[in-house]
Interface confidence: medium
């Protein structure tokens, strides 16, 4: 089941251009920006997604684009360089010819540079944490009931396995869940962590990245869970090279 | 008490369609994963699909090739499973089936049962 | 498309006695197998999950086994109650799968 064949959409991806020109007059998707085929049954990368999200009309975005200097997460919005399978190449670079190194992710791993700037290996971000604060409520959650729910929505909304959400911590109102996967336990077919914290993020921002879906409505034993802050933490594999100058 | 209840079978014609209910009672079918499960006669069990009403996801076997589609009213309690292009291979008896509420898929809680005959 | 397969398709047992259901996934599907019990006319039910975890309401004469690829259903002290069809079914995945059962043991008490 690549892509609904009804009426030839993707039902993972808004952000494809979709058409029955696959095999046997099979519904086949291409994501916008990069005209790769994606297939629907699963999540698109997070590479191909910011390319598709850079290509858009501009009036399409709602979010200004921070400036360069700015210290809050920019979104990870800019035009990433993606490898035939969709994830990002090792190394990243502007127009004005500025180059960095990111890590699996598409996140800046290194200082900045030139042309010359080598990235020999694409790092993976084998731990992501994810730090929510939800809207206040009548009382705290319960504890097993919000870890149940939570891997529930990873497994169903983004099929990302069990295995991969390591735990899901609770202190009110702050909810961190811990997403691990290894280059090892990742096995074909695997939805990658960092893929299911995109389309999670965007999700809990309002903006969600599946087709005709209405927006996430998360509940905890039919109390909704309103989300008011996120922060997204990655750990790599290989620690980020940075010089002491970004650190004082 | 939390229960299952399949209808909608019969007897169809070859290339016909039919539509199966599944009405769930006593729990929110919302949050739980429910599978179609098929049984022709004499033979063993054989999964059709899946959906997470919640999330509206739905999963099918590699053989289904479109041909059958799985739904839900939620407000209804109720999920469907449209069979069409219907051959003399898909007379069986159709279960729904509803997953543990936990992180895997095993399945604790089945309806009886709707017996679906294709014959001309 | 992980693949299960089970031994031996029928086995007949006394009454009293102790039989042994074999299942085996073409791939390692860790501890995620769940046996059922089926009876002519009647829908399956679930016997045990996780491999081994017996479900509610569950005669402790079953017991589960295994992880990865090989798995057991053993039933001892065998009652003429017992005489059903068994299927495991593995719980791990949903996705590109064909069928995530088994095909099924019968077991025939004398």
């Known amino acids: 089941h690549t892509a609904a064949q009804d009426n030839c959409t993707c039902p993972t991806n808004k952000m494809t251009v979709c058409s029955p020109d696959g095999p046997g007059g099979r519904c086949q998707c291409r994501a916008l920006g990069s005209g790769m085929a994606v297939d629907c049954s699963t999540l698109t990368s997070k590479c191909l997604l910011l390319k598709a999200r850079m290509s858009a009309p501009k009036n399409a975005r709602t979010l200004v684009r921070p400036s360069e200097h700015a210290l809050v997460d920019n979104d990870g919005l800019y035009d990433p360089d993606c490898d035939p399978e969709g994830r990002f190449k090792a190394r990243q670079c502007n127009q004005t010819s500025v180059c960095w190194c990111v890590n699996s992710v598409g996140v800046r791993r290194t200082d900045k540079g030139d042309l010359s700037l080598r990235c020999d290996e694409l790092v993976r971000t084998h731990h992501i944490l994810i730090d929510l604060r939800h809207r206040p409520t009548a009382g705290a959650f319960n504890h097993s009931d919000l870890d149940a729910e939570l891997r529930r929505l990873f497994r169903e909304r983004y099929r990302l396995h069990p295995k991969f959400v390591a735990a899901v911590h609770y202190e009110q109102p702050t909810i961190q869940i811990e997403l691990r996967q290894n280059t090892s336990q990742k096995a074909a077919g695997d939805v990658d962590i960092g893929d299911a914290a995109y389309y999670f993020e965007r999700d809990i921002k309002g903006e969600s990245l599946f087709q005709g879906r209405g927006g996430l409505d998360l509940r905890v034993r039919g109390e909704p869970l309103q989300v008011e802050r996120t922060l997204i933490y990655y750990l790599d594999e290989i620690p980020p090279k940075f010089s002491m100058k970004r650190l004082t | 008490q939390e229960q299952l209840k399949e209808s909608g079978g019969g007897l169809v014609q070859p290339g016909g369609s039919l539509t199966l209910s599944c009405k769930a009672s006593?729990?929110?079918?919302?949050?739980?994963?429910v599978s179609w499960v098929r049984q022709a006669p004499g033979k063993g069990l054989e999964w059709i699909g899946y959906i997470y009403p919640a999330y509206h996801n739905t999963y099918y076997a590699t053989w289904v090739n479109g041909r059958f589609t799985i739904s839900s009213h939620n407000a209804q309690n109720t999920l469907y499973l449209q069979l069409n292009t219907l051959t003399a291979a898909d007379t069986a008896t159709y279960f729904c089936a509803r997953d543990a509420g936990s992180t895997d898929y095993n399945l604790n809680l089945w309806g009886p049962g709707t017996l679906v005959t294709v014959s001309s | 498309d992980v693949v299960m397969t089970q031994t031996p398709a029928s086995v007949e047992v006394a009454v009293g006695g102790t039989v042994t259901i074999k299942c085996q996934a073409s791939e390692d599907i860790e501890s995620y197998l769940a046996w059922y019990q089926q009876k002519p006319g009647q829908p399956p039910r679930l016997l045990i999950y996780e491999a081994s975890k017996l479900a509610s309401g569950v005669s402790s004469r079953f017991s589960g086994g295994g992880y990865g690829t090989d798995f057991t259903l053993t039933i001892s002290g065998v009652e003429c109650a017992d005489a059903a069809t068994y299927y495991c079914?593995?719980?791990?995945?949903?996705?590109?799968?064909?069928?995530?059962f088994g095909g099924g043991g019968e077991v025939v008490v004398k």
């Open positions: 006593g729990f929110d079918f919302n949050y739980y994963g």
């Open positions: 079914h593995q719980a791990l995945t949903i996705g590109n799968v064909d069928n995530p």
